[in-house]
């Protein structure tokens, strides 16, 4: 079952997600999506990183931590009840079926 996180309407929500950088030091691409993690990729992508940068995002979503050191925790600004639900943090490790997938449940009250 998903780990549950709570936030109040009008506040910022925080969904933690971390990974350990490979010994090469290069970043692993990460995607965040609304909805449980599918077999591949992320559904309804709200944010994505590549080898160096955040390269896709939608307006209320950002990574406030040091994502270049493996802290890819998601912040959602000014949440509403519509933001409730499951979010997927997917660490896209190279290779077949190597991805790390984390489903996080956000409850807005």
């Amino acid at each position: 079952s998903e780990v549950e996180y709570r936030a109040e309407v009008g506040q910022n929500a925080y969904l933690p997600c971390f990974y350990t950088l490979p010994t090469s030091g290069t970043l692993v691409p990460v995607c965040w999506g609304k909805g449980a993690c599918p077999v591949f990729e992320c559904g309804n992508v709200v944010l994505r990183t590549d080898e160096r940068d955040v390269n896709y995002w939608t307006s209320r979503y950002w990574l406030n931590g040091d994502f270049r050191k493996g802290d890819v925790s998601l912040t959602i600004e000014n949440v509403t009840l519509a933001d409730s639900g499951i979010y997927c943090c997917r660490i896209q490790i190279p290779g077949i079926m190597n991805d790390e997938k984390f489903n996080l449940k956000l409850v807005i009250k």
């Epitope: 080898e51 940068d53 390269n55 209320r60 950002w62 990574l63 931590g65 270049r68």
Partner: antibody, heavy 114, light 108 residues
């Protein structure tokens, strides 16, 4: 100590191209990104793109795609920026900056004039 | 892309005065990658504050930085003559990296 030494000023005519260099010293060149930044006279700063010397991978600001080409010569620890089809809008000071924007070159002044 | 809006564009302050420069982002950015630079005419930008609140080497303790998400600021607790310069905020978390338009700080 870390240093980024850029090539000297350039005066060129419209329609031509130019190649600006940035020689790095004081660190392992292939381990860190190099960024390029444009500054028009009396104006703000614009990021052009980065290159990772270890792999040659590049990323460009969409605005500068087709205008700037970033390359490196790892044997001499030099990063280059080639600017093509020059117009007066390209007249500016161009800076190279280190991986984390903590070290900057002294800037290269490019003047495009007929 | 993320637009960084700095205000005011130009301001003057007397020696000893407290000065606050602001930088507003159109979307949230990582506080780890929100930087401030000082630039004087004819010189390269100098890293002044990194990761929102950390002073670069050699920067006087009268400078401080704060903020998160979409709102950041640089404060000088007591203005000195040598602080007259342009200050730029910069985010390099989201590609393309962007800079604010700058604040030109003058001495009264």
């Amino acid at each position: 100590q870390i240093q980024l030494q850029q090539s000297g000023p350039e005066l060129v005519t419209p329609g031509t191209s130019v190649k600006i260099s940035c020689k790095a010293s004081g660190y392992t060149f292939t381990d860190y990104y190099i960024n390029w930044v444009k500054q028009r006279p009396g104006q703000g700063l614009e990021w052009i793109g980065w290159i990772y010397p270890g792999s040659g991978n590049t990323k460009y600001n969409e605005k500068f795609k087709g205008k700037a080409t970033l390359t490196v010569d790892t044997s001499s620890s030099i990063a280059y920026m080639h600017l093509s089809s020059l117009t007066s809008e390209d007249s500016a000071v161009y800076f190279c900056a280190g991986d984390r924007f903590d070290y900057w070159g002294q800037g290269t002044t490019l003047t495009v004039s007929s | 892309q993320i637009v960084l809006t700095q205000s005011p564009a130009i301001m003057s302050a007397s020696p000893g005065e407290k000065v606050t420069l602001t930088c507003s982002a159109s979307s949230g950015v990582s506080s780890s990658y929100l930087y401030w630079y000082q630039q004087k005419p004819g010189s390269s930008p100098k890293l002044w504050i990194y990761s929102t609140s950390n002073l670069a080497s050699g920067v006087p303790a009268r400078f401080s930085g704060s903020g998160s998400g979409t709102s950041y600021s640089l404060t000088i607790s007591n203005m000195e003559t040598e602080d007259a310069a342009s200050y730029f905020c910069h985010q390099w978390s989201n590609s393309p990296y962007t800079f604010g338009g700058g604040t030109k700080l003058e001495i009264k």
